[in-house]
Interface confidence: low
């Protein structure tokens, strides 16, 4: 088969800060005279092949664009007809058209511009969950967890921040952990607690606010 062909989704959508895997298969002529290894690169549409670096490549000698370095990864091995692309920490300005290019020295150089990938990075619409184990009882320590189960394990780990205007049992107003350990007091009842999660790889922050319901054990004196 002397045809160059690429099979991949025409369009992929991912929310900013998250990850996406783009399955891709690539086919090229099997010319016996080409002795060099097959290398592949993903490039952004509109760039000059001689002046601009790819966003991801299998060629260890080739530089990649600074904006995508460490975030765009050519997972597949083009020598095995796999051009799968993995994107982590997606950013809004990643939105655009991308195409694959295969090189096999000295004869084969081909850009698959008829099968371009349209990448859409949309606003992060998900919010964290604040998990409270059981009830909050005044005078008893409790662990609150801020959870982002939809986040990508392969992405840059998010940072957590807790904020409250009137949480008397917090020594400081913020903590960098996803778990907040505190001992609520009766006067904390009804106050608001916010967990902010920042995905630094994409520069986006999401938050969840709850109202604390602090109960007293029977027998506890009211002030």
């Amino acid at each position: 088969d002397l045809e160059f062909q690429l099979v991949a989704p025409e369009s992929v959508t991912v929310e900013e800060g998250l990850c996406v895997h783009v399955p891709c298969s690539v086919f090229y002529p099997s010319i016996k005279l080409t002795l060099g290894p097959v290398t592949g690169s993903w490039l952004r549409k509109g760039v000059s092949l001689h002046e601009d670096s790819p966003v991801a490549t299998s060629d260890p000698r080739q530089l990649v664009q600074k904006a995508t370095q460490g975030r765009f990864q050519l997972l597949g091995d083009p020598q095995k007809h796999d051009c799968s692309l993995f994107i982590r920490d997606a950013q809004k300005n990643d939105t655009g058209m991308y195409f694959f290019r295969v090189v096999r020295e000295p004869f084969v150089r081909y850009s698959y511009k008829k099968s371009q990938l349209s990448l859409h990075v949309t606003s992060l619409s998900r919010t964290p969950d604040i998990i409270i184990p059981g009830t909050l009882e005044a005078g008893y320590p409790s662990n609150l967890t801020c959870s982002v189960p939809w986040a990508c394990e392969q992405g840059t780990p998010p940072t957590f921040s807790w904020m409250s205007t009137a949480l008397t049992s917090l020594s400081s107003r913020t903590t960098d952990s996803s778990v907040l350990t505190f001992t609520p007091q009766p006067q904390d009842h009804g106050t608001k607690l916010t967990c902010l999660v920042t995905f630094s790889g994409a520069g986006v922050t999401v938050e969840r606010t709850i109202q604390l319901n602090v109960t007293r054990k029977s027998g506890q004196m009211r002030e």
């Epitope: 989704p9 959508t13 991912v14 996406v20 399955p23 993995f86 859409h120 990508c152």
Partner: nanobody, 120 residues
Amino acid sequence: EVQLVESGGGLVQPGGSLRLSCAASGGTFVINAAWYRQAPGKQRELVASISYGGSTNYADRVAGRFTISRDNAKNSVYLQMNSLRAEDTAVYYCRLDPGLALNNRPLYYWGQGTMVTVSS
């Protein structure tokens, strides 16, 4: 260990509907998900796929009849099959992609398959 549980297959008359489900257990994070099918004596073929962000792709022969969806919180993917035809008879497999690579090769998880028979 990641395990996939598929359900929803069965016998249905032409023109009928079925809903297939595939749930992943074992704590894996699913980025892309897809349904494949394999009819007797034929190669396995892609039916539909869906990305984490919700973009979908369908094989031409099922477009407009089948709908793929997912519940990210439940790590589950579904295939709603309407207006079923005899040629849809096959074993349907779900494939989940955790976005991981082993020795620079993408790693996929496959279900055990569920039989769909369309016959009058």
